[in-house]
Interface confidence: low
C-alpha cells in the first residue's frame, strides 16, 4: 500500500450565496488525521495517533493552509453558474501518494451536491470529466474560473501536487506512520439468536495495514460467502483498523467452528467460546 495524504474540503451555498464556513478533513494513510471546523478553522489532530505524528508542534501551518484552501474553494463555488435555490455543496478532494518505489501520484476531484464533475491528475495536469451535460457545464465553470488569474492557476495546479507531497513526506518522517505492520487483536463472541441457534462474531481490531482476511470455518473448511456477514474495515482512531465477521450456527456445534484470520503473511485460528464464556482474546505476534 502506498502512503497517502487526502484532503477533503467542503463549502456550502444557500440560495446562491456562499456561506462563510467550511469543513476540512485530512486523512493520512487512510486514517482520520486533522479536522477543521466550519466557522473557525483550527487544525485539530484526530486522536492520539495524529498528535504523535508531529509530537508537540502546533498546527498553525496546517491551520493557515487549510484556511487558505477553504477561501479558494468558496471563491470557486461563487463562480458556479445557474445555481438553483436551496442548499448546495462544493467539495474538493485532493489525494497524493508515495509508492514503495518512490513514484508519486496526485489527483484532485470536484463534487457538486455530491456528484463528481471534474477530476485532474496533478502530475500530468490532465482534466477528466463525466459525459453528462450537467457535469460538463459545471466543469467549464470551474475551469474557466481557475484560468482567470495566473497566481490562482499556479495554486491549483503546480503547487498543490508539490505541497501535498511535501506535507506527506514531512509527516512520514515522524516515523509513527512508517510502522508498517501491527497485528490484530482477535475477539470471538457469541450471542443468542433464536431457539436452537447462536450468532458468533469474530472481531479483529488494532491492525495495520488495512488488508485482512477474516472468515468462519466449519471443520476447517471456509463457509460459503452467503452464510457470513462482514463489517467494513474501518479506522479505529489510533492509526489502525477494525473489522468483524459473523455467522449463525446451531447451538451445541460450537467446537466445529473457528474464526480464521490472515494479516500481513501471518494467520491464526480462534475457536468459539463454550458455555457462558463471552470473550476469548488472542493476540499473536
Amino acid at each position: 500500500e502506498p502512503h497517502s495524504l487526502r484532503y477533503n474540503l467542503t463549502v456550502l451555498s444557500w440560495d446562491g450565496s456562499v456561506q462563510s464556513g467550511f469543513l476540512t478533513e485530512v486523512h493520512l494513510d487512510g486514517q482520520p488525521f486533522l479536522r477543521c471546523d466550519r466557522q473557525k478553522c483550527r487544525a485539530k489532530p484526530q486522536g492520539q495517533w495524529a498528535e504523535d505524528v508531529l509530537g508537540n508542534k502546533t498546527w498553525d501551518r496546517e491551520t493557515r493552509d487549510l484556511t487558505g484552501n477553504g477561501k479558494d474553494l468558496r471563491m470557486t463555488l461563487a463562480h458556479i453558474k445557474d445555481q438553483k435555490e436551496g442548499l448546495h455543496s462544493l467539495q474538493e478532494i485532493r489525494v497524493c501518494e508515495i509508492h514503495e518505489d518512490n513514484s508519486t501520484r496526485s489527483s484532485q476531484h470536484f463534487y457538486y451536491d455530491g456528484e463528481l464533475f471534474l477530476s485532474q491528475n496533478l502530475e500530468t495536469k490532465e482534466w477528466t470529466m463525466p459525459q453528462s451535460s450537467r457535469a460538463q457545464t459545471l466543469a467549464m465553470n470551474v475551469r474557466n474560473f481557475l484560468k482567470e488569474d495566473a497566481m490562482k492557476t499556479k495554486t491549483h495546479y503546480h503547487a498543490m501536487h508539490a505541497d501535498c507531497l511535501q506535507e506527506l513526506r514531512r509527516y512520514l518522517k515522524s516515523g509513527v506512520v512508517l510502522r508498517r505492520t501491527v497485528p490484530p487483536m482477535v475477539n470471538v463472541t457469541r450471542s443468542e439468536a433464536s431457539e436452537g441457534n447462536i450468532t458468533v462474531t469474530c472481531r479483529a481490531s488494532g491492525f495495520y495495514p488495512w488488508n485482512i482476511t477474516l472468515s468462519w470455518r466449519q471443520d476447517g473448511v471456509s463457509l460459503s460467502h452467503d452464510t457470513q456477514q462482514w463489517g467494513d474495515v474501518l479506522p479505529d482512531g489510533n492509526g489502525t483498523y477494525q473489522t468483524w465477521v459473523a455467522t449463525r450456527i446451531c447451538q451445541g456445534e460450537e467446537q466445529r467452528f473457528t474464526c480464521y484470520m490472515e494479516h500481513s503473511g501471518n494467520h491464526s485460528t480462534h475457536p468459539v467460546p463454550s458455555g457462558k464464556v463471552l470473550v476469548l482474546q488472542s493476540h499473536w505476534q
Epitope: S103, R105, K125, W127
Partner: antibody, heavy 118, light 107 residues
C-alpha cells in the same frame, strides 16, 4: 483552427546538436492546462514521446533521453523548441510536435524528417 | 515506465468485418488510455480518448472499451480508408508511452 508545423535542419552529422521549432496557431500556450509535446518516429517504427512543456513553463522529459533534451517556448511568438545534443544515427526519424490539452494529443503537426549521417 | 503492449502486430481483414485491436498496460492506468490512427505518410490522429470517449469528426464505427490494464479498440465495419497503424497511449503517468502499434491491412 488549430495548426502546428515543425521545422528542422533535415540532415545532421553525428555528434551535432539538433534544433527543432514548432510553430502553432489557433491556441495559446498561456492558457492554463495547455501543453505542447514532441514525439518522434523512426521510419517504419513506432511513436516515442520525447518531451513536454506546459503553459506554466513546467517541463517533462523522457527519462531515457533526459540528458540530451532541452525543451523551451516563446509564448508570445507561439513557438516551442526542442534541442537534442550529440545526435547519432539512431536519432534519424520524423519529429512531430503535438498539442496536449486534456491529457491526450489532439492536434499534431505534419512532422519534419531528420537524417543523421556522416 | 508503464509498458504498453499491442496485439496483434498485423491484422488482415476483409472489408465490412468487425475487428478488435488489443492493448495491455503493464500496470493499471484506470481509463487513461488513448487511441491514435496513423495512415501511410500522415501524422497520427486522435481516435478515442479515455478508453471509450468518442472524438468529434471520427466515424461512429470506431469505439473503445476497457479499464485498468486491458483495452480494446473496435471497428464495427472496416472500410478501405481504415488501413493504417493504430497506436494506444498511456496518459496516466510520465513518460507518455505508446504501444508498438497494430497494422491493419485489407486481404
Amino acid at each position: 483552427q488549430v495548426t502546428l508545423k515543425e521545422s528542422g535542419p533535415g540532415i545532421l552529422k553525428p555528434s551535432q546538436t539538433l534544433s527543432l521549432t514548432c510553430s502553432f496557431s489557433g491556441f495559446s500556450l498561456s492558457t492554463s492546462g495547455m501543453g505542447v509535446g514532441w514525439i518522434r518516429q523512426p521510419s517504419g517504427k513506432g511513436l516515442e514521446w520525447l518531451a513536454h512543456i506546459w503553459w506554466d513553463d513546467d517541463r517533462y522529459y523522457n527519462p531515457s533521453l533526459k540528458s540530451q533534451l532541452t525543451i523551451s517556448k516563446d509564448t508570445s511568438r507561439n513557438q516551442v523548441f526542442l534541442k537534442i545534443t550529440s545526435v547519432d544515427t539512431a536519432d534519424t526519424a520524423t519529429y512531430y510536435c503535438a498539442r496536449r490539452l486534456n491529457g491526450y494529443f489532439d492536434y499534431w503537426g505534419q512532422g519534419t524528417t531528420l537524417t543523421v549521417s556522416s | 515506465d508503464i509498458v504498453m503492449t499491442q496485439s496483434p502486430a498485423t491484422l488482415s481483414v476483409t472489408l465490412g468485418d468487425r475487428v478488435s485491436l488489443s492493448c495491455r498496460a503493464s500496470q493499471s492506468i484506470s481509463d487513461y488510455l488513448h487511441w491514435y490512427q496513423q495512415k501511410s505518410h500522415e501524422s497520427p490522429r486522435l481516435l478515442i480518448k479515455y478508453a471509450s470517449q468518442s472524438i468529434s469528426g471520427i466515424p461512429s464505427r470506431f469505439s473503445g472499451s476497457g479499464s485498468g490494464s486491458d483495452f480494446t479498440l473496435s471497428i464495427n465495419s472496416v472500410e478501405p480508408e481504415d488501413v493504417g497503424v493504430y497506436y494506444c497511449q498511456n496518459g496516466h503517468s510520465f513518460p507518455f508511452t505508446f504501444g508498438s502499434g497494430t497494422k491493419l491491412e485489407i486481404k
